[in-house]
């Protein structure tokens, strides 16, 4: 029987922020409750001279009034004792976009091909997650090779999220567009 308590989930050992830097394309996602990036999601991670990791992300968001906008999001990451677990503060460049604080865990990555990210926003009393989200990232916008897919699939299983992901479309919707010139 799989242990679905968040405290039991393993993350990337000896995570290297510098090697993780650069562009990652979201291939699949498990959504949390509420407003969230829909598709065309691309994230750019960087590390400054002090070693702090930050990220910018772009993706299509459907607002409550059914407007589609390309959102520019920014996140900064605070280190914890575990090098693969961060406290993430995020906000949208436009004022109407979401902002908040989430855990941000790098569950696994080989730095060159794939990455699996996980965040639990709300714990149940039994230690399982009541509201989580997760991304499968690829360095290649076209997808992951079969051998990486099997590793990712295993990680999804270990997060107790195996059948909860949706594929993410990359159709150029947000190329050269942002919420500033859509509204």
């Amino acid at each position: 029987e799989r242990d679905c308590r968040v405290s039991s989930f393993r993350v990337k050992e000896n995570f290297d922020k510098a090697r993780f830097s650069g562009t990652w394309y979201a291939m699949a996602k498990k959504d949390p409750e509420g407003l969230f990036l829909q598709d065309n999601i691309v994230a750019e991670f960087s590390v400054d001279e002090t070693g702090q990791m930050s990220a910018t992300a772009k993706g299509r968001v459907r607002l409550l009034n059914n407007w589609d906008v390309c959102a520019d999001m920014v996140g900064t990451f605070t280190d914890t004792e575990d090098p693969a677990k961060f406290k993430m503060k995020y906000w949208g460049v436009a004022s109407f976009l979401q902002k908040g604080n989430d855990d941000h865990w790098i569950v696994d990555t080989d730095y060159d091909t794939y990455a699996v990210q996980y965040s639990c926003r709300l714990l149940n009393l039994d230690g399982t997650c009541a509201d989580s989200y997760s991304f499968v990232f690829s360095r290649d916008p076209n997808g992951l090779p079969p051998e990486a897919q099997k590793i990712v699939r295993q990680r999804q299983e270990e997060l107790c999220l195996a059948r909860q992901y949706r594929l993410i479309v990359h159709n150029g919707y947000c190329d050269g567009r942002s919420e500033r010139n859509l509204l």
Epitope: A28, P141, N142, L144, Q149, R163, V169
Partner: antibody, heavy 124, light 108 residues
Framework: QVQLQQSGPELVKPGASVKISCKAS????????IHWVKQRPGQGLEWIGW????????EYSEMFKDKATLTADTSSSTAYMQLSSLTSEDSAVYFC?????????????????WGQGTSVTVSA | QIVLTHSPPIMSASLGERVTMTCTAN???????LHWYQQKPGSSPKLWIY???NLASGVPARFSGSGSGTSYSLTITSMEAEDAATYYC?????????FGAGTKLEIK
């Protein structure tokens, strides 16, 4: 709804080539694998290979490496299979089928939608 | 390559009878990557059971699948006329992908 529409039956001469098509609709063509499967009359299913239209990457069964060439045109959401140097052994129905990548987290690579099949008859 | 062997190759069952067919691999297959398809004459195969035990959309609850390692089975609790077909197991565990030769299920 998801559909894979294959081209019509082909009657070809030994030694010739044939190119059959599989037009996809109702889903994001570049995000799923397209497999090709051979079925000779009264026989079972043989996997020929797959193409991932997003990248153009392909993988072939060793048995079909010199026989089949898989391509895809993302602008028309159509996958193609060319069969060369045809012999009577190549007379069969050829199916295209879709499978999601494993990170979709569902179906684990199973072929969830199939085309109706294209009959290829090799005869002088 | 992984060879999948069906047993029996052909079987017949009376309406209402319980039916079990097996698929044996010559090396271990991850149960997540073992699937079954149903095919009727003149039609395309249909995904029937995926990941050993999950019924595909629209498949009646009288069907079930089980197994692990090298031995897998498909069971029908109570045979109905529409179940007459050929059933193929398929592995996505290792390339080349392979299918079994099938079990043809007929009505007695």
């Amino acid at each position: 709804q998801v559909q894979l529409q294959q081209s019509g039956p082909e009657l070809v001469k030994p030694g010739a080539s044939v190119k059959i098509s599989c037009k996809a609709s109702g889903y994001s063509f570049t995000r799923y694998y397209i497999h090709w499967v051979k079925q000779r009359p009264g026989q079972g299913l043989e996997w020929i290979g797959w193409i991932f239209p997003g990248s153009g990457n392909t993988e072939y069964s060793e048995m079909f490496k010199d026989k089949a060439t898989l391509t895809a045109d993302t602008s028309s959401s159509t996958a193609y299979m060319q069969l060369s140097s045809l012999t009577s052994e190549d007379s069969a129905v050829y199916f295209c089928a879709r499978s999601p990548p494993l990170y979709f987290g569902n179906y684990e690579g199973a072929m969830d939608y199939w085309g109706q099949g294209t009959s290829v008859t090799v005869s002088a | 390559q992984i060879v999948l062997t069906h047993s029996p190759p052909i079987m017949s069952a009376s309406l209402g009878e319980r039916v079990t067919m097996t698929c044996t691999a010559n090396s271990s297959v991850n149960s997540s990557y073992l699937h079954w398809y149903q095919q009727k004459p003149g039609s395309s195969p249909k995904l029937w059971i995926y990941s050993t035990s999950n019924l595909a959309s629209g498949v009646p609850a009288r069907f079930s699948g089980s197994g692990s390692g090298t031995s897998y089975s498909l069971t029908i609790t109570s045979m109905e006329a529409e179940d007459a077909a050929t059933y193929y197991c398929h592995q996505y565990h290792r390339s080349p992908l392979t299918f079994g030769a099938g079990t043809k299920l007929e009505i007695k």
